[in-house]
Amino acid sequence: MMTGTIETTGNISAKKGGSVILQCHLSSTMAQVTQVNWEQHDHSLLAIRNAELGWHIYPAFKDRVAPGPGLGLTLQSLTMNDTGEYFCTYHTYPDGTYRGRIFLEVLESSVAEHSARFQIP
């Protein structure tokens, strides 16, 4: 039975050209996290964090995506096209798969609000 829950940063906003941290946290389960996948709104893969082999950043994003902190992901040099949904998928044993959702809104610098507690200034 899957007892865990995913907590995420929820809806966040960040400045165009800036950076933001996407963070998910799995709680209420003793399951072993074998891998965390980060996907973009069009379901393209951004990065993988495998428990045994570490971080793998999809080649197309290697200049704009940095691993961490922890199992989170840092997006850099944000553009307006980065606005949209992001998903963290926790692959665990024996529970199975947990999935969390974050909505990122990239704002023009003049109107950006610092609404995310995980946001990098």
């Epitope: 893969l45 993988i48 495998n50 045994e52 793998h56």
Partner: antibody, heavy 121, light 108 residues
Framework: QVQLVQSGAEVKKPGASVKVSCKAS????????MHWVRQAPGQGLEWMGI????????SYARKFQGRVTMTRDTSTSTVYMELSSLRSEDTAVYYC??????????????WGQGTMVTVSS | EIVMTQSPATLSVSPGERATLSCRAS??????LAWYQQKPGQAPRLLIY???TRATGIPARFSGSGSGTEFTLTISSLQSEDFAVYYC??????????FGGGTKVEIK
């Protein structure tokens, strides 16, 4: 040209161990993951595990954990797969296969010729 | 683990005809899917990676499509050397990386 050359066929008794080698040539050995895949007679392909030849990091299929050990010798560009406590069901052709660069998991573009391991009393 | 399901198990096709092979993943693998061809007594050979990109030296009659959970390998006009077993594989979640059970393409 890029190639993987495996060691020869083996006949083992139940309970014994077998160590299969896979020598790589024609490319930068530490830069690509190496996988081991087996195929029982008349059956499909079964992934056993992966090794990062640069760091020696490994990840094994749960089914084989505790029985399989993958190692590498960078000086000879060779990877090894040792399977212990052999049983008749381990009778199979064992393949090494080159995966993607160690920065990203990729498909298996180069395969060894296979090593037949027969377990029989 | 991600379960890969191939259909049909066996496909009987006449030379020159089109063959369509299907592969379904139990959860999204994005485009991280490969197709392999295996002939009796030989090691598998990579045909398609990234769901739709042909590997080096693979003829244009082989094409791959799909993303997420549904994928297709199409052989536009079967040649005699194409009769073999075909496997799909996801390479995005491990352990374990998983293969489908295979589709045998045989002469009708």
């Amino acid at each position: 040209q890029v190639q993987l050359v495996q060691s020869g066929a083996e006949v083992k008794k139940p309970g014994a161990s077998v160590k299969v080698s896979c020598k790589a040539s024609g490319y930068t050995f530490p830069a690509y993951y190496m996988h081991w895949v087996r195929q029982a007679p008349g059956q499909g392909l079964e992934w056993m595990g992966i090794i990062n030849p640069s760091l020696g990091l490994t990840s094994y299929a749960r089914k084989f954990q505790g029985r399989v050990t993958m190692t590498r010798d960078t000086s000879t560009s060779t990877v090894y797969m040792e399977l212990s406590s052999l049983r008749s069901e381990d009778t199979a052709v064992y393949y090494c296969a080159r995966g993607g660069r160690t920065t990203w998991i990729g498909a298996f573009d180069i395969w060894g010729q296979g090593t037949m391991v027969t377990v029989s009393s | 683990e991600i379960v890969m399901t191939q259909s049909p198990a066996t496909l009987s096709v006449s030379p020159g005809e089109r063959a369509t092979l299907s592969c379904r993943a139990s959860q999204s693998v994005s485009s991280n899917l490969a197709w392999y061809q295996q002939k009796p007594g030989q090691a598998p050979r990579l045909l398609i990676y990234g769901a739709s990109t042909r590997a080096t030296g693979i003829p244009a009659r082989f094409s791959g499509s799909g993303s997420g959970t549904e994928f297709t390998l199409t052989i536009s006009s079967l040649q005699s050397e194409d009769f073999a077993v075909y496997y799909c594989q996801q390479y995005v979640v491990w352990p374990p990386l998983t293969f489908g059970g295979g589709t045998k393409v045989e002469i009708k």
